[in-house]
């Protein structure tokens, strides 16, 4: 499975979109987990609403928010106030009973904000209004790389 690499600026938000076959995954909740090492388990960070029909409602765990558009087949995860410790390998998962199917692997890289070393003055932007969406924002880049990490559940 390819790994998508997403970069975000420290202190800002990074938005991850995982697409899937909406009919194949009908009725299934989605989750975002962090993989602990190359061979390690994937530790659940947040999952969508327990009632599948309400999966569009945002669920939050700390600074991570998840919401699922089950008709379009897109689950969106937002990592707010990105910190260096948020860097690492994650998975979007589709949950079916005890099973977790990997929809996408995502490597999150956190870039230091160059303004951290200067007096930002009036250039500071509130965190809520600075949201990166994958490669769609100028200083958030996305690339694919082949990895040998096994799917974990």
């Amino acid at each position: 499975l390819n790994t998508t690499v997403l970069q975000g600026m420290a202190g800002q938000s990074l938005r991850v979109s995982c697409t899937y076959d909406a009919l194949k995954h009908w009725g299934r909740r989605k989750a975002w987990c962090r993989q602990l090492g190359e061979e390690g388990p994937c530790q659940r960070v947040v999952s969508t609403h327990g009632v599948w029909l309400l999966a569009f409602l945002k669920k939050r765990n700390g600074s991570t928010v998840i919401a699922d558009d089950t008709l379009a087949g897109t689950v969106t995860i937002t990592l707010k106030n990105l910190q260096a410790g948020d860097a690492g390998l994650y998975q979007c998962q589709s949950l079916r009973g005890r099973e977790a199917e990997v929809l996408q692997k995502v490597l999150v890289e956190v870039l230091e904000d160059p303004l951290d070393d200067q007096d930002a003055g009036d250039l500071w932007v509130p965190e809520e209004s600075s949201s990166f969406e994958g490669a769609q924002v100028e200083h958030s880049t996305s690339r694919n790389q082949e990895t040998s990490f096994p799917p974990t559940s």
């Epitope: 076959d21 009919l23 194949k24 009908w26 009725g27 009632v51 029909l53 009973g97 005890r98």
Partner: antibody, heavy 122, light 108 residues
Framework: EVQLVQSGAEVKKPGESLKISCKGS????????IGWVRQMPGKGLEWMGI????????RYSPSFQGQVTISADKSISTAYLQWSSLKASDTAMYYC???????????????WGQGTTVTVSS | EIVMTQSPGTLSLSPGERATLSCRAS???????LAWYQQKPGQAPRLLIY???NRATGIPDRFSGSGSGTDFTLTISRLEPEDFAVYYC?????????FGGGTKVEIK
Amino acid sequence: EVQLVQSGAEVKKPGESLKISCKGSGYSFTTYWIGWVRQMPGKGLEWMGIIYPGDSDTRYSPSFQGQVTISADKSISTAYLQWSSLKASDTAMYYCARAGHYDGGHLGMDVWGQGTTVTVSS
Amino acid sequence: EIVMTQSPGTLSLSPGERATLSCRASQSVSSSYLAWYQQKPGQAPRLLIYGASNRATGIPDRFSGSGSGTDFTLTISRLEPEDFAVYYCQQDDSAPYTFGGGTKVEIK
């Protein structure tokens, strides 16, 4: 009418190959998982595996992994179960069944084929 | 693999009586993924109950399912002549999606 129609009974010799079929109609074949279930004479039901015809994603029971191959041709709404080398112990009734779903859950196997009898004897 | 154990193996009852069939899982199973099937001789199985307690389309209300975790029950409130058959439970919480060994409900 939603239905699954299976191919006819087969009589084979040990070592021969075989491919039986299950044709879906009356619904969107590519958007429901299709499972295969074995029932040996006078015995209970055994889950063999399942396939999603939309992308041919397939899962097998460990008991049947490597013993059979499950496939599908979505262009003709048909799922298949095949053996490369039959054994006498493969003698059984084989059912295909649709794994239904609803908003927020799973219906179980809600539509079944009529079954295909496979007899393997020298 | 989750092992599903059904009891009793055979239930001998008369029409009009109540039948209680048990299905026990070797590990906890989400009730969303527990189904019951009926099979008559020479016929394919038929879905009766899904999600542990929901009747499938066209199933009479004398059939009901209950339970959670590892213990599930299928109840037929008043047996009709056409209810004498073999009943199977199945979990599809975790692959392989195993069936129980079946309970035969026979006429006493």
